[in-house]
Structures are given as C-alpha cells and as structure tokens.
Amino acid sequence: EAHKSEIAHRYNDLGEQHFKGLVLIAFSQYLQKCSYDEHAKLVQEVTDFAKTCVADESAANCDKSLHTLFGDKLCAIPNLRENYGELADCCTKQEPERNECFLQHKDDNPSLPPFERPEAEAMCTSFKENPTTFMGHYLHEVARRHPYFYAPELLYYAEQYNEILTQCCAEADKESCLTPKLDGVKEKALVSSVRQRMKCSSMQKFGERAFKAWAVARLSQTFPNADFAEITKLATDLTKVNKECCHGDLLECADDRAELAKYMCENQATISSKLQTCCDKPLLKKAHCLSEVEHDTMPADLPAIAADFVEDQEVCKNYAEAKDVFLGTFLYEYSRRHPDYSVSLLLRLAKKYEATLEKCCAEANPPACYGTVLAEFQPLVEEPKNLVKTNCDLYEKLGEYGFQNAILVRYTQKAPQVSTPTLVEAARNLGRVGTKCCTLPEDQRLPCVEDYLSAILNRVCLLHEKTPVSEHVTKCCSGSLVERRPCFSALTVDETYVPKEFKAETFTFHSDICTLPEKEKQIKKQTALAELVKHKPKATAEQLKTVMDDFAQFLDTCCKAADKDTCFSTEGPNLVTRCKDALA
C-alpha cells in the first residue's frame, strides 16, 4: 500500500531506536571515511525530520523518496570531493542513478585501521556513561568496514554486544568475562558479513533469479515439509528483503524482514515444526533465530525423484512451457531430500539437469537422451565429498594453524601474483573452515564446508576485481558463483609465473615480533611462508616444512634470549642463509 510519506511510514514501523540504527548503518556504509560524529549529526537531522513527517505527512519534503532524502543529506556533507574523490560526482546525478553511483563506490577493502577493542575497564566506563553512543560507535565501525553487512543482523549483533557488556561490566573480572564472549560475537559477525556479501554478489552479478534459486534450495533443505508454493512465497519474500539490503534500502529491508518473520511465525503449521522457540523471542533475536533454525524432519514417504523428472512423459513439455516452475520444482524436490548437500552443489545439479533437458528435448527420442541424467550427477556429488574428506583429514592432522599454512602454500602456488596480504587473509579464512565445519556430524560437513568456502572465495574475487593480477583467479571469478569453488580447487601451480627474486629483507625480523599477540605472530610467519612460495613455487612440502620449523625455532630462541636485539641481528642472517640453502 502506498504511503504519503515513506519516511514517516518507516519510522512508525521500525520505532526510533531501530530507525536511527539503520540510518547510521546506511550512512556509514555509503561514506566509509566519515567519523562517527559526522554521521551521528546526520542521523539526528534525519530522525528529527522523520518525526516532523510523522506529525504531519503533508509537511514539506515528506513525500520524497528515502533515496532522495538520504542522498541529499550525503551530498550536503562539506569537503565531499576532498575526502571521497570521484564519489562526489554521484551528487551531480538524479535518482535512481545517484543511489546506483553510491553503491558502485562502496569499498569492500577500505583503508581503515583494524577495529581495535579497548581494554575491559575503559570499555565498561564508556558503555556505562552513554550506552547509546557506545552502540552507535559499534554500528558505525562495523558498517564502514563491511559496507554490505546485513543491516538488521548488525542491529542483532549490537544487541548481543549490549547484553554482554551489561552482564560483564557488573562482574569483578570484566576482562575474562568479556573477551571470550565478544570474540564469539566477532567471529559470528565476520562470517555473517562474508555470507551476506556473497548474497549481494549473486544479486548484483546474476540478478534476482539467481538469488531466488539459492533461496529455494536453502529453504527447501530447512523446511522439507513445506509445499512448493510455500517455499516459493518464502523465497520471493527473502529475495525482496536481500535485494533491498544489498541495494542500500535498509529501512525497507529491516521492515520487510520483520514482516517475513511475522508471517513465518503465523504460519508455522505449513512451514516447519521447529519454529516455535524462535517465534517466542523478541524481533531481532526472532529473525536471527529463524535464519539459522535447524532443519525440520524430512517426510518419510517421499517418492523417488525420477518419477516426475525422468520417467514422466511430459518432462520436456513441462520444461519448455515453464522452465522457472519446472526447474524450481526440481530444485525444491531435490533439496528437500538432501539437507546433507551444500546449496552450491544443489544448484550445480539443477544446472546440469537443465542443460541436459535443453540438449535432449528437441531430439527424436528425448527420454533415451535424458534418461541417465540422475546417474550423471554422481561425479558432481563425489567431487565436493572428496574435498571435504581430504581437507578435514588434513585439518585433523595439522590443527587450524598448520591447516591454514597448507592452504596458504596451495593458493600461493595457484595464484602467486596475488598480493601476500590478500593470500594470507584468504588462507587464514579458508583454514577456519576446519574448526567451523570438520567437527560437525558427517551429514552437516559438506554444506558447512562448501558454502563457507564459496563465501570466502567470493571475497577473494571481489578484492582481485579491484586490481586483477592473476589469470587463474580471473578465470575462476568470471564464471558462475556456484562453479567458483570447484574452479579454484581444480587450479594447479601457475606455470606462467616467473619466481620472485630472493630478498633478504623480506625474511628479516626484529625483536618487536616477540611482544605481538599470537594472531599477529602467526600472520608474520604466514607472510614469510607466502613469500617463500613466491620465491620457490615448486618447493616441496618437506622443504617448506624444514624452513618454517627452522624459522619457528629461531623466533622461539631469540624471543627467549636475554638480549633479543642481538640475537635477531646475528641469528637472522644465518636463518636467511639456511633458508636459501634449503630451497636451493
């Protein structure tokens, strides 16, 4: 239904707190360099204006679109060109081009310092002094670093943050209460960020239909008792919500997400028997809970998939007359039978099925041509299963850090032209799949591993797009989203790469490494490992292990030495020489 004033409508629907949070996220995601105070001022102005529109929907400018209102605010910021360069050119455009322009200037890798967590006492003090401002800072800092973060989920994480601080700041030992809890939230939020970025990539590169297919597969796995019409309705609504968030329409997105949660809770009987616990929660927790609710029990009496999709006489007719419905039904039926498959795999199977029908249906005897299609799925299923087994075995043998190193070597060999920081970040993230997924029950491993890897590789593609350097990466990134992971897995050593010259300074370390937190130490060592591979792309695993063990021993010895500086300056060059010899 059309509203006289869109901004008043959203303010009323969302309430002041969520309205302000979402506007702050929107501004922080568009203008990623502005300070919190600059954005907070704009948010207050927008909120005050929204209130005037609530009081009188006919007041001046209240009928303007949200894009117009927000865009005008952003374009009125002083020194826009000095701070943002060509993004300022967006302000010469009219809506909807202006908003499209802002979206195109979102930076997935902004040059901002890492978000450092203050120490416990300081955090609790500023939280107690002004919880609203404290939370505002959190939203701002996360949103500007993650310009596609799913806004309603970010509000949920802020609420989690708030609850943790409220609880832990009352404890005697604040630090030991806060650290593990906040680390947990941070880890979950980072995963949420890469997953959502993948959804936006799907939407941006391949359109709504691609995202809707993803949603149908995912929802069918989770709600196998819901019928196709119900799954289609949920997928359509979920597509709209994600399209809005990916498009910067955060107020609409949050509002529609709340509506979807409401609908699901009012229609549990036709959706799933597992929703009640989620539905008892308040809004943000409810929506979050629904998004990761456990799979419902599969119906016991499902017929074989072949009946409708291979044996039926009307297969080709049904395909040709309504591909969206017929292939959507195939995806639904296959997915609800396979909660143990990744969404990426299910989409590959649906694509294979579609390609087979497209090839066969015009032939003289179509059933003879497409009759073996389900058997032809086997290699497509075996490939990711083998990937999971191989990688989880390796993870169990090496542990997370060792597993990350193995992946780092592998990916540096595949794409040695990629910058070392990007390779290290990717390998560390890819390596976390072990901890995240390999400990799960067998039937949950494959969906966990492959869908997580796909999201991480999407980030690799986004970073590479900014400065393309590797033909291997370009090849894998320019194909369809669901083919990316298999493409990367299939890459071998890049034979076109000319090895980097050995530079002693790259492998020269100083005593300051000893005081670094463990994570930073690991990154330093992994940076050296990537550089070694770039110097010797064909070095064997044994050679690299020898060098890295020697390196670890060197750090251990010098960090324990009474005179660390002398140890580093005398033993360092010896280490470099030994490294060169070991790799010769």
Epitope: G207, R209, C316, K317, Y319, A320, E321, A322, K323, D324, V325, E354, L357, E358, K359, C360, C361, A362, E363, A364, N365, P366
Partner: antibody, heavy 121, light 110 residues
Framework: EVQLLESGGGLVQPGGSLRLSCAVS????????INWVRQAPGKGLEWIGI???????FYATWAKGRFTISRDNSKNTVYLQMNSLRAEDTAVYYC???????????????WGQGTLVTVSS | DIQMTQSPSSVSASVGDRVTITCQSS???????LSWYQQKPGKAPKLLIY???KLTSGVPSRFSGSGSGTDFTLTISSLQPEDFATYYC???????????FGGGTKVEIK
C-alpha cells in the same frame, strides 16, 4: 550442402487457409527442430512456433489456434498450416533450424530463403 | 508481457567506426538465451552470436556480444562495407512460447 526451401506462398483471401512447406536437403530432418518465423514488409522478425524432432510443437501465444506445424520425416519436410488468415498475416515466412544441442533457445543457424504470403481481397 | 527493446532503431556510420547496438529485455531472458542476427535486404537472417557472447563459427571477430539478464550489447569494433545491414536480437524466456525478437537496428552508410 544443407538447404531449407520454403514453398506454398502466394495470394490468399482474408479468412482463407494456406499450407506452407519447408523442404530440407543435405541433412536428415528427423534429428532436428525446425521453427517458423515471419517478417511483415518493412518490419521485424516474429517467431511463430517450433516442432521438435519428436513431433512435439510449441507456438507463440498469438499463433495458437490458427497456426499448426507438422512434419513428415519420410519426405524430409515440415509444414505450416495457416487458417483464418487476416491482412496482418501478410509477410515473408521463413523456416529455420534450431542449433543442434538446444531445444528452447532462440538460436537458428540455417534459414530458408522465405516465401511471401499476401492476404488481400 | 514480454518486451524486447532494441536501440537505436537506426544508426549512420562510416567504415572503420565502432558501432554499438543495445537490446533491453523485460523480464530478463532465461539463462542468457540471447542471440544476435544480421539481415541484408531480400535475404534471410544470419546467426552471429548466441548465449549473449558466443560467436557463431565463421563470424568475424570484430563482432562481439556482452551483457546478461536484461541488458545486452552487440558491438562491431570496426565497421566493414559488408556490415551495413539490419541487426536483430532474439530472446528466450521461461516459456518457449515467449520467444521474441527485438525491433531491429538498421546500420546505414553515413
């Protein structure tokens, strides 16, 4: 050399019927899908329908009911039966083969030279 | 209703020019089912490009296609005398019955 050759065009009165033929030489028609496409004088292309190798047919929404496609593999010929013809059906009618390996895609790699149908009183 | 809009409807260009023709579809075509045809007066159309960007064998490499979803482009990088003709895009959709051609773009000698 593969050739598609349309015939059967000519002048027909409004409300009349006409059957066009598309004779195929150089390939065995029984393995291919054939489309009919028309082009009114000075206008663009308009897809009419398709017949798959199996004999299954599909039509553009506007063509359903008045137009029927059939085939006789023994004669290596596809037909377009047109009924209740109107002045706006005046056009050059082409038959065209769908690229092998596709069934529903608009990829037509071999075309006949076309036959003109004029509907006028 | 299916809409396949080609623009411009005609373009005047000289030999050696770069020519770009666009085709906008509503709704989006199915699975990049988009083709480009060239038609010369009194002749049947000729398939140039299929799957939005794949060149039919024998078609010169100066022809290229790009795009996905709803927006597609045919580019002739350096127009040759034999390229003066009318160009059509063709789209396939969820239902085969919706197969449609664009209105055509006539490339004329300037």
């Amino acid at each position: 050399e593969v050739q598609l050759l349309e015939s059967g065009g000519g002048l027909v009165q409004p409300g009349g019927s006409l059957r066009l033929s598309c004779a195929v030489s150089g390939i065995d028609l029984s393995n291919y899908a054939i489309n009919w496409v028309r082009q009114a004088p000075g206008k663009g292309l308009e897809w009419i329908g398709i017949i798959w190798a199996s004999g299954t047919t599909f039509y553009a929404t506007w063509a359903k009911g008045r137009f029927t496609i059939s085939r006789d593999n023994s004669k290596n010929t596809v037909y377009l039966q047109m009924n209740s013809l109107r002045a706006e059906d005046t056009a050059v009618y082409y038959c065209a083969r769908t690229v092998p390996g596709y069934s529903t895609a608009p990829y037509f790699d071999l075309w006949g030279q076309g036959t003109l149908v004029t509907v006028s009183s | 209703d299916i809409q396949m809009t080609q623009s411009p409807s005609s373009v005047s260009a000289s030999v050696g020019d770069r020519v770009t023709i666009t085709c906008q579809s509503s709704p989006s075509v199915w699975s990049n089912f988009l083709s480009w045809y060239q038609q010369k007066p009194g002749k049947a159309p000729k398939l140039l490009i299929y799957e939005a960007s794949k060149l039919t064998s024998g078609v010169p490499s100066r022809f290229s296609g790009s795009g996905s979803g709803t927006d597609f482009t045919l580019t002739i990088s350096s127009l040759q005398p034999e390229d003066f003709a009318t160009y059509y895009c063709g789209g396939g959709y969820s239902s085969i019955s919706d197969t449609t051609f664009g209105g055509g773009t006539k490339v004329e000698i300037k």
